[in-house]
Interface confidence: low
């Protein structure tokens, strides 16, 4: 398959990805499937230099990540290694609180106002980024 | 520094609904994140938790009040509110407003100076 | 509900003496558990969170252990500024509640 060289347009190019910033709220499930639509998938934060680059575009505002813990363990929807992996949790989180009496714990993650991760109910409709890397192939099939 | 101060009558008869203000300085109401709580303490007793608030007007209350209770919020003011209907004696308490750490589970950070509230005729 | 049940209810200390006071939960909730200090005529004041995190500004002698559904704050050489009835409170289950309080007296 062909590669992609520039970003789709609305879609912000950094360090070979391609971000795309939402202005409304979702749950993190319709986000997750908003991104995979796009051919993308929910941020997935490997570094403290992007970890900076998404904070500046969401300001402070509650925003889905890529992450999340709802078949046991933190995983990042692209596969990439939760345990040995960048993670910038607020203090004393991650902590599956039950307390909000919306029913189960919490399961996803998201940035904070500041910047910093924290989970939440998945079901709470926050704003989302979608990433995608530009080297990644195509899904258009080969020319013969 | 978030500093929260408690207001309103001091007396309130018996079947009567019993009004609170919350008025919040130095940090702003809106900030998500931060739940808003009512707890009161009966003469010379312990602490009983009577519900929270979010910034968006979500809500949740002790089952033991629920049906009496209700807590709002005017962001335009900075302040959250407290209703008890049909109060009886046994209503009669320190009520203190307070809020809760980042993200909800971090225990009470901050406390108004509390308000003394009798239910008497 | 998860009911905290606090012992001693009272408790009349020296100055300098060592002072533990417990609170046990009806079931586990981790460590969602908090502890304040309320003097007379003033709200109560966070000292300790999550069951062993000092809270800013509190006076080292102060600590807290335990998880699950036991839980301690100790105060290490009392003083009499310490004078005070002590709350826990358990954030990890609504509707959220306190302990009955331990009043501590200096003797």
């Known amino acids: 398959g062909s590669e992609r060289t520039c970003c789709p347009v609305n879609w912000v190019e950094h360090e070979r990805s391609c971000y795309w910033f939402s202005r409304s709220g979702k749950a993190w499930a319709d986000a997750d499937n908003y991104c995979r639509l796009e051919d993308a998938h929910l941020v997935v934060v490997t570094s403290w230099e992007e970890q900076k680059f998404v904070q500046h575009h969401i300001g402070p505002v509650n925003t889905w990540m890529g992450l999340h813990d709802q078949n046991g363990p933190w995983k990042w929807v692209d596969g990439t290694d939760y345990e040995t992996g960048f993670k910038n949790w607020r203090p004393e989180q991650p902590d599956d609180w039950y307390g909000h009496g919306l029913g189960g714990g919490e399961d996803c993650a998201h940035f904070t106002d500041d910047g910093r991760w924290n989970d939440d109910v998945c079901q709470r409709p926050y704003r989302w980024v979608c990433e995608t890397e530009l080297d990644k192939a195509s899904q258009e099939p080969p020319l013969l | 520094q978030v500093q929260l101060q408690e207001s309103g009558p001091g007396l309130v008869k018996p079947s009567q609904t019993l009004s609170l203000t919350c008025t919040v300085s130095?940090?702003?109401?809106?900030?998500?994140?931060?739940?808003w709580s009512w707890i009161r303490q009966h003469p010379g007793k312990g602490l009983e938790w009577i519900g929270y608030?979010?910034?968006?007007?979500?809500?949740y209350y002790n089952p033991s009040l629920k049906s009496r209770v209700t807590i709002s919020v005017d962001t335009s003011k900075n302040q959250f509110y407290l209703k008890l209907s049909a109060v009886t004696a046994a209503d009669t308490a320190v009520y203190y407003c307070a809020k809760g750490g980042y993200n909800w589970n971090n225990g009470f950070d901050c406390w108004g100076q509390g308000t003394l509230v009798t239910v008497s005729s | 509900e998860i009911v905290l049940t606090q012992s001693p209810d009272f408790q009349s200390v020296t100055p300098k003496e060592k002072v533990t006071i417990t609170c046990r939960a009806s079931q586990s909730i981790g460590s969602s558990l908090h502890w304040y200090q309320q003097k007379p005529d003033q709200s109560p004041k966070l000292l300790i969170k999550y069951a062993s995190q000092s809270f800013s500004g509190v006076p080292s002698r102060f600590s807290g252990s335990g998880s699950g559904t036991d839980f301690t704050l100790t105060i290490n050489s009392l003083e009499a500024e310490d004078a005070a009835t002590y709350y826990c409170?358990?954030?990890?289950?609504?509707?959220?509640?306190f302990g009955g309080g331990t009043k501590v007296e200096i003797k």
């Open positions: 409170h358990q954030s990890g289950r609504l509707p959220l509640t």
């Open positions: 130095g940090g702003s109401i809106s900030n998500s994140g931060y739940y």
């Open positions: 608030m979010y910034y968006s007007g979500s809500t």
